[in-house]
């Protein structure tokens, strides 16, 4: 299964309106929204409509789109109105190869890394923004601290944990704290005057299809925090995995296609075939996420121009015992990071 659908050009001929030059109004003010937001199919983002009014299921590749029914911004889709001249009222969601991203009204080019603020580093890959926190103490001090508080320190970007019961702190807890920190997914090792740190990979930015996952690491010559990114594909969007769940079972933890295929990315094809495993689905309220995985390097060959390689998430096994929060909110897992709102807003 391809990492990314091969970009296609689709044409759409809208039904003629009485007045072909009149643009219909798709937004109504004041906003009129249903009481509860819609439930979107797996992998389809739940987003605010183009009128900035209601939650809608984002239009997908090939779907009709309007100023209200907007295309999925997390999938690098844009509304192509070229088939609706001269009104430009109804378009078709299309994929731009190497599409850039827009965050807070600022456009970023494909592959560009940027800091929306001092707390986060983000990367744009094919319309998807993946961010990692630069403040490396997302957890309160453990073991000895009974009353931790997260406070802003004047002149410093990152908030610090302070402990109101500092006076009762037992001695020699630094070693314990370090162990607790190391067990939490951070990789620590001391070399020269640098404490090496590698954050865990962020969750994949999409629940199906091609997404991005990022992490920060200072394991480099300068001991400087740098962002690494890898492509991820938790499950294909075009396969109904529920159909593969065995009789009597509630989950299919891992879905693996029968045939090995090439990965494709922006029109380029992997130099060898792969038979990847994908995370499956459950019929109850559980979600399947990668449990045992590694990062592999995939070489791509392009029809014109040089090839390139990309780091790609390779799933070995998935864990299906987490309750699903909102499977359509691709940034839901970022909420566990402090100041998530600062990325989202």
């Amino acid at each position: 299964t391809a990492l990314s659908p091969t970009p296609t050009t689709m044409t759409f001929t809208p039904a003629p309106l009485e007045e072909t030059t009149t643009r219909p109004e798709f937004c109504k003010w004041p906003c009129e929204c249903p009481q509860s937001p819609p439930r979107c199919p797996l992998g389809v983002s739940l987003i605010t409509d183009g009128c900035e009014c209601c939650k809608i299921c984002a239009q997908q590749l090939g779907d009709n789109c309007t100023e209200a029914a907007i295309c999925d911004p997390h999938r690098g889709l844009y509304c192509d109105y070229s088939g609706d001249r001269p009104r430009y009222a109804i378009g078709v969601c299309a994929q731009v190869v190497g599409v850039g991203c827009v965050l807070d009204g600022v456009r970023y080019t494909n592959g560009e890394s940027f800091q929306p603020n001092c707390r986060y580093n983000c990367t744009c890959i094919d319309g998807t923004v993946g961010c990692t926190p630069l403040c490396l103490s997302p957890r309160p001090p453990r073991l000895w601290c009974r009353q931790p508080r997260h406070v802003r320190v004047p002149g410093q970007c990152c908030e610090q944990w302070v402990c109101d019961d500092d006076a009762r702190r037992p001695r020699q807890t630094a070693l314990l704290d370090t162990r607790a920190f190391a067990a939490s997914g951070a990789v620590e090792q001391r070399y020269e005057n640098c404490i090496a740190y590698t954050s865990p990979w962020s969750p994949c930015s999409t629940t199906c299809g091609l997404g991005i996952s990022t992490r920060i690491s200072n394991v480099n010559a300068r001991c400087w925090p740098e962002q690494e990114s890898r492509l991820c594909n938790l499950r294909p969007c075009d396969v109904d995995i529920q159909l593969h769940i065995k009789a009597g079972k509630k989950c299919l933890a891992v879905y693996q296609p029968e045939e090995a295929t090439n990965f494709t990315l922006a029109g380029c094809v992997s130099t060898r075939t792969y038979r990847p495993k994908y995370c499956g689905v459950c019929t109850d309220n559980r979600c399947c996420i990668p449990y045992k995985s590694k990062t592999i390097s995939v070489d791509f060959q392009c029809p014109e121009g040089p090839g390139f390689s990309r780091q790609v998430l390779w799933i070995n096994a998935c864990f299906c015992n987490l309750s699903c929060r909102n499977p359509n909110d691709i940034f839901a897992d970022l909420e566990s990071y402090p100041d998530f709102e600062e990325i989202a807003n």
């Epitope: 079972k249 989950c251 933890a253 891992v254 495993k277 045992k292 070995n316 096994a317």
Partner: antibody, heavy 121, light 110 residues
């Protein structure tokens, strides 16, 4: 090639807990599903539990539910099996054995050398 | 009481063909694959047959497995002295939601 090396023999009193370790080399734990099997003296093999790739969670034999905990430390590629509230009938050789995710079928191969746990007052 | 039943013992002379049966039910062998393990005296078990009839590399072709309905069997042709060991079948049991081993068969080469 995967190799599993287990911790040494243990003697425990009834009611105590034992924690057996299993160190992986040749592969990393992220590529393996670890299972634990025990064998009482002169008796057959008894599966205790392990990560089931099909169900996507660690499953335990009903007999050991609530008494056994299986954990992993991926930074050291070491798996652990802790059995609590020990009784004399828990005296056995405890084996770790792996299922490799590369395989299309569930098969336990290879196995650790075994750890003898003796429960005696 | 094992979910899979095996005869406690089997025997044969060198060069002979021996089969070991493994009987289960629709909740295990009937709907899942069977593996066979060999345990030589004083050693850890070793995978002998997986997926009913597949041999891992390094296992001689004298060993073969088969499955029919809710039963499986292991056949050893051209029996050799070094085949003297305990043999266990293993499958997944849906009703128990776990993996199960047979009671084991002690093979003696006379």
């Amino acid at each position: 090639e995967v190799q599993l090396v287990q911790s040494g023999a243990e003697v425990k009193k009834p009611g105590a807990s034992v924690k057996v370790s299993c160190k992986v080399s040749g592969y990393t734990l992220t590529e393996l599903s670890m299972h634990w099997v025990r064998q009482a003296p002169g008796k057959g093999l008894e599966w205790m539990g392990g990560f089931d790739p099909e169900d996507g969670e660690t499953i335990y034999a009903q007999k050991f539910q609530g008494r056994v905990t299986m954990t992993e430390d991926t930074s050291t590629d070491t798996a652990y099996m802790e059995l609590s509230s020990l009784r004399s009938e828990d005296t056995a050789v405890y084996y770790c054995a792996t299922f490799m995710f590369d395989h299309d079928w569930f098969q336990l191969d290879p196995w650790g050398q075994g750890t003898l746990v003796t429960v005696s007052s | 009481q094992s979910a899979l039943t095996q005869p406690p013992s089997a025997s044969g002379t060198p060069g002979q063909r021996v089969t070991i049966a493994c009987s289960g039910s629709s909740s295990n062998i009937g709907t899942n694959t069977v593996n066979w393990y060999q345990q030589l005296p004083g050693t850890a078990p070793k995978l002998l047959i997986y997926n009913n009839n597949q041999r891992p590399s390094g296992v001689p072709d004298r060993f073969s497995g088969s499955k029919s309905g809710t039963s499986a069997s292991l056949a050893i042709t051209g029996l050799q002295a070094e085949d003297e060991a305990d043999y266990y079948c293993q499958s997944y049991d849906r009703s128990l939601s776990g993996y199960v081993f047979g009671s084991g068969t002690k093979l003696t080469v006379l």
